[in-house]
Interface confidence: low
């Protein structure tokens, strides 16, 4: 197809040779009401299009990406020729940096609904350069951690050496979606949650006397848990008395939640108190019943083959412990009446 009608955008990727990083291109197809590239503007108000006009990037799910070879050869389908470039919906992911990624990338909708849509395309001229030694030595990493539950910030690597005052206006995206309120070179997160994790893109415009281009950097942000500062808490049993039937078997479950610890050595055990005596009970092994990045719920049961009168005088104590401390919950058995 003829790409002369495509809108053009110039981008610069300056990558660090010291770290692995990746890059993305968005298929920023022009909004029909803002651009002469898509056909809605070519209709007078009285004309009614036979097909729905192309709606721009908001409802864009199916686009085709091409690379334009520098020697003038025909356009190449990205998916067939470039294994280190992966298309995900309307985003192109470059998994490895390198000057060989420089070139012209074209995207357009897969479904051409009318002759006018042929010109509904974007040409992105990407220049890729290694960072020079003269560049800032302590630039922000392309991989940044945020500690869950605390305050944190995400810095734009290409601007992290500049003060907030001298920084140009920055456009931020998270997982391909525009973060419209963020305009500075640093996003401050008041309280970090799981959903702050993702792929962030920061763009700013740089100009010289001849032209202007977008400088883009990609930051992978991970939310991490610090080692817990809490001792485990017992979720069950909640009550300190339990109604039972004499002569019947009984299982009492102790469920405890342990916060994340890098060196994890949980203890969960049952012991029995009988007047001044106290002893640990041999009970089935503990089981993990729920496991997440932040905590683990472990269960351990005590099983009585049949409840006796003596059991009513005892206290059954669940004891749980981590490196921070321990928690106990005792249960007194009470005969069911009637």
């Amino acid at each position: 197809f003829n790409i002369s009608g495509c809108s053009t955008k110039k981008l610069l990727w300056t990558y660090s040779t010291r770290s692995e990083e990746e890059f993305v291109l968005f298929c920023d197809l022009p909004e029909p009401q803002k651009s002469h590239f898509c056909h809605r503007n070519r209709l007078s108000p009285k004309q009614v299009p036979e097909h729905l006009p192309f709606m721009g990037s908001n409802d864009l799910s199916d686009v085709q990406w091409y690379q334009q070879p520098s020697n003038g050869d025909p356009l190449e389908d990205i998916r067939k020729s470039y294994p280190h470039i992966i298309q995900d919906k309307c985003t192109l992911h470059f998994l490895t940096p390198g000057v060989n990624n420089s070139g012209s990338y074209i995207c357009r909708p897969k479904m051409i609904k009318s002759p006018y849509d042929v010109a509904c395309c974007v040409k992105m001229i990407l220049e890729v350069k290694p960072q020079t030694n003269a560049s800032c030595e302590y630039s922000a990493s392309h991989k940044q951690d945020l500690l869950l539950g605390s305050t944190g910030s995400i810095s734009c690597p290409s601007l992290s050496c500049q003060s907030d005052a001298q920084s140009p206006a920055v456009t931020w995206y998270k997982n391909g979606k525009l973060l419209s309120v963020e305009r500075s070179n640093r996003i401050v997160v008041d309280e970090v949650y799981d959903y702050h994790q993702g792929t962030y893109v920061c763009d700013y415009t740089q100009s010289d006397t001849v032209s202007s281009w977008t400088v883009r950097a990609v930051v992978q942000v991970r939310t991490i848990v610090g080692d817990t500062k809490l001792k485990p808490d017992i979720l069950d049993p909640v009550e300190d008395t339990l109604e039972v039937e004499l002569g019947k078997p009984l299982t009492i479950s102790c469920k405890a939640r342990f916060g994340f610890e890098r060196v994890f050595n949980p203890v969960i055990k049952w012991y029995i108190k009988d007047s001044d005596l106290e002893w640990e009970v041999s009970v089935p092994e503990a089981k993990s019943i729920k496991s997440t990045l932040k905590d683990e719920i472990i269960e351990r049961n005590i099983i009585l083959e049949k409840v006796t009168q003596r059991d009513l005088r005892r206290k059954f104590v669940c004891f749980v412990q981590n490196s921070i401390g321990n928690t106990t919950q005792s249960v007194q058995l009470k005969e069911k009446r009637g």
Epitope: Q220, R222, F264, A286, S288, S291, T292, L293, E296
Partner: antibody, heavy 118, light 110 residues
């Protein structure tokens, strides 16, 4: 249902290369670290390497010596193992295994067999 | 490098009996140890993690113990279905997690 499924194994000549894939389904790939583990015929399990899925930082067993590369693509829920400069000693079933909350592997794929032979 | 030494390499016991498998770490790994069961042609199956925690759905006949550098897997009331190879696996942190498996122990049930 949570699953891992390896593919890409096959016969390759000594000195050749191969790229293995591990496709995850039924869980959010970006919340778990994943390892590659291999097992030569009739031998024990051998840890190859591990990748942090969000930052795609990879760590390897010392014997790998830069011949293997682990990468991942979260959006496609897929993990990769690029095998280069293969020798007969690399003949094995390659498993991908998901790391649990701490340092254990609680979900394994069925494995894919790589045979290096002329 | 972290080295896991598993003994014995093979053990035989009768149905209803007990077998004990040992695993020694070359450095302190606290409780970062797991045990797996693997049958011929199958993927490994997690039995125990954190040295002594039983994975959900695993019979309580399997018991893990130990911490630091010495660990034990005990299988009591042996069943025919327990015939398999058992592996210990550990992790330690340097700047990142590094994992290692023991050499395996074949359990034969008579």
């Amino acid at each position: 249902q949570e699953q891992l499924k390896e593919s890409g194994g096959g016969l390759v000549q000594p000195g050749g290369s191969l790229k293995l894939s591990c496709k995850a389904s039924g869980f959010d790939f970006s919340n778990y670290g994943v390892s590659w583990v291999r097992q030569a015929p009739g031998k024990g399990l051998e840890w190859v390497g591990y990748i942090d899925p969000v930052f795609r930082s990879a760590y390897y067993a010392s014997w790998v010596n830069g011949r293997f590369t682990i990468s991942s693509h979260n959006a496609q829920n897929t993990l990769y193992l690029q095998l280069n400069s293969l020798t007969a000693a690399d003949t094995a079933t390659y498993f991908c295994a998901r790391k649990g909350y701490f340092h254990y592997f609680n979900l394994w794929g069925p494995g894919t067999l790589v045979t290096v032979s002329s | 490098a972290l080295v896991m030494t598993q003994t014995p390499s093979s053990v035989s016991a009768a149905v209803g009996g007990t077998v004990t498998i040992n695993c020694q770490a070359s450095q302190n790994i606290y409780s970062n140890l797991a045990w797996y069961q693997q049958k011929p042609g199958q993927r490994p199956k997690l039995l125990i993690y954190g040295a002594s925690n039983l994975e959900s759905g695993v019979p309580s006949r399997f018991k893990g113990s130990g911490s630091g550098t010495e660990f034990t897997l005990t299988i009591s009331d042996l069943e025919c279905d327990d015939a398999a190879t058992y592996y210990c696996q550990s992790a330690y942190y340097s700047s990142s997690a590094v994992y290692a498996f023991g050499g395996g122990t074949e359990v034969v049930v008579k």
